[in-house]
């Protein structure tokens, strides 16, 4: 099939006092090969500071996955979700407050 870029969605939730968990979800992409990771100041965090979900079919012939990490509240602007799929890449910031960020990555 043809390449379908992912929809990337970044959310945040309270983890513990002074910390938040930020989750980056990619969905609706094809083929299944994707790089999804959190970066601090433009540098990929080490693997053991991130949690990854499996790349799973979403029932529409496309795939979905996620990556999460815990960060200090107030440092959100230093963290971005980095996505690379089929030779295209994009970065996605942590939303302020409890808002959500949804957008397609365009070629």
């Amino acid at each position: 099939g043809s390449t379908v870029p992912p929809m990337v969605n970044v959310t945040r939730s309270e983890a513990s006092e002074g910390n938040i968990t930020v989750t980056c979800r990619a969905s609706g992409f094809y083929p299944w090969n994707i790089t999804l990771s959190w970066r601090q100041d433009g540098v990929s965090l080490s693997h053991d500071t991130q949690q990854w979900g499996d790349v799973l079919p979403d029932g529409n012939g496309t795939y979905q996955t996620w990556v999460a990490t815990r960060i200090c509240q107030g440092e959100e602007q230093r963290f971005t979700c980095y996505m690379e799929h089929s030779g295209n890449h994009s970065t996605h910031p942590v939303p302020s407050g409890n808002s959500h960020h949804h957008h397609h990555h365009h070629h």
């Epitope: 601090q40 100041d41 433009g42 540098v43 990929s44 965090l45 080490s46 053991d48 230093r78 970065t91």
Partner: antibody, heavy 119, light 108 residues
Framework: DVHLVESGGGLVQPGGSRKLSCAAS????????MNWVRQAPEKGLEWVAY????????YYADTVKGRFTISRDNPKNTLFLQMTSLRSEDTAMYYC????????????WGQGTLVTVSA | QIVLTQSPAFKSSSLGERVTMTCTAS???????LHWYQQKPGSSPKLWIY???NLASGVPARFSGSGSGTSYSLTISTMEAEDAATYYC?????????FGSGTKVEIK
């Protein structure tokens, strides 16, 4: 003002060890990533190692992996580079650099400390 | 690892001349993770242009940067004596971080 002062350089025999230090001042050290970058005489720049603010993300250049260890003591505002199994090709000026938050990049550099590996 | 190839290695320019140097990556990198540094003999390097096109503090407006994918460039619109230096590009798209081999700019 941001100041980065390296120390610990000198003459070392091949196969020997050396520990470099970088004393940081003028900024909140424990919130910044730090790096070591080196430059052999009359040569270009070579990145050596990166450590993030919490010491939980560390990367090395392939040329030093397994021989060099980057670490930091946040309460003492000090960055370290432990170098072992030194080779002649490790001869260089070693710079301590501060990583720019958000955008990345080496935003501040020390004056460097010279390490010479020779018999 | 991502190899950055800079050209030319050496550039001799007249005062007032337009100078362009390029940095070519061995694989595509994000423009967010490409920076330029200036170094003069006997001195430590300085961050000169960050995230491809943003001038660092104190850098004259005659400097500009651009590019995307595998091709990046630094331009001096009108060469001045104080611009004589070596310029290095650098990427942190992927570890290990790498530098280009540098472009040395001299006054003709």
């Amino acid at each position: 003002d941001v100041h980065l002062v390296e120390s610990g350089g000198g003459l070392v025999q091949p196969g020997g060890s050396r520990k470099l230090s970088c004393a940081a001042s003028g900024f909140t050290f424990n919130t910044f990533g730090m790096n070591w970058v080196r430059q052999a005489p009359e040569k270009g720049l070579e990145w050596v190692a990166y450590i993030n603010s919490g010491s939980n993300t560390i990367y090395y250049a392939d040329t030093v992996k397994g021989r060099f260890t980057i670490s930091r003591d946040n309460p003492k505002n000090t960055l370290f580079l432990q170098m072992t199994s030194l080779r002649s090709e490790d001869t260089a000026m070693y710079y301590c650099t501060r990583w720019e938050p958000v955008t990345g990049g080496f935003s501040y550099w020390g004056q460097g400390t010279l390490v010479t590996v020779s018999a | 690892q991502i190899v950055l190839t800079q050209s030319p290695a050496f550039k001799s320019s007249s005062l007032g001349e337009r100078v362009t140097m390029t940095c070519t990556a061995s694989s595509s990198i994000s423009s967010s993770y490409l920076h330029w540094y200036q170094q003069k003999p006997g001195s430590s390097p300085k961050l000169w242009i960050y995230t491809t096109s943003n001038l660092a503090s104190g850098v004259p407006a005659r400097f500009s940067g651009s590019g995307s994918g595998t091709s990046y460039s630094l331009t001096i619109s009108t060469m001045e004596a104080e611009d004589a230096a070596t310029y290095y590009c650098h990427q942190h798209h992927r570890s290990p971080f790498t530098f280009g081999s540098g472009t040395k700019v001299e006054i003709k």
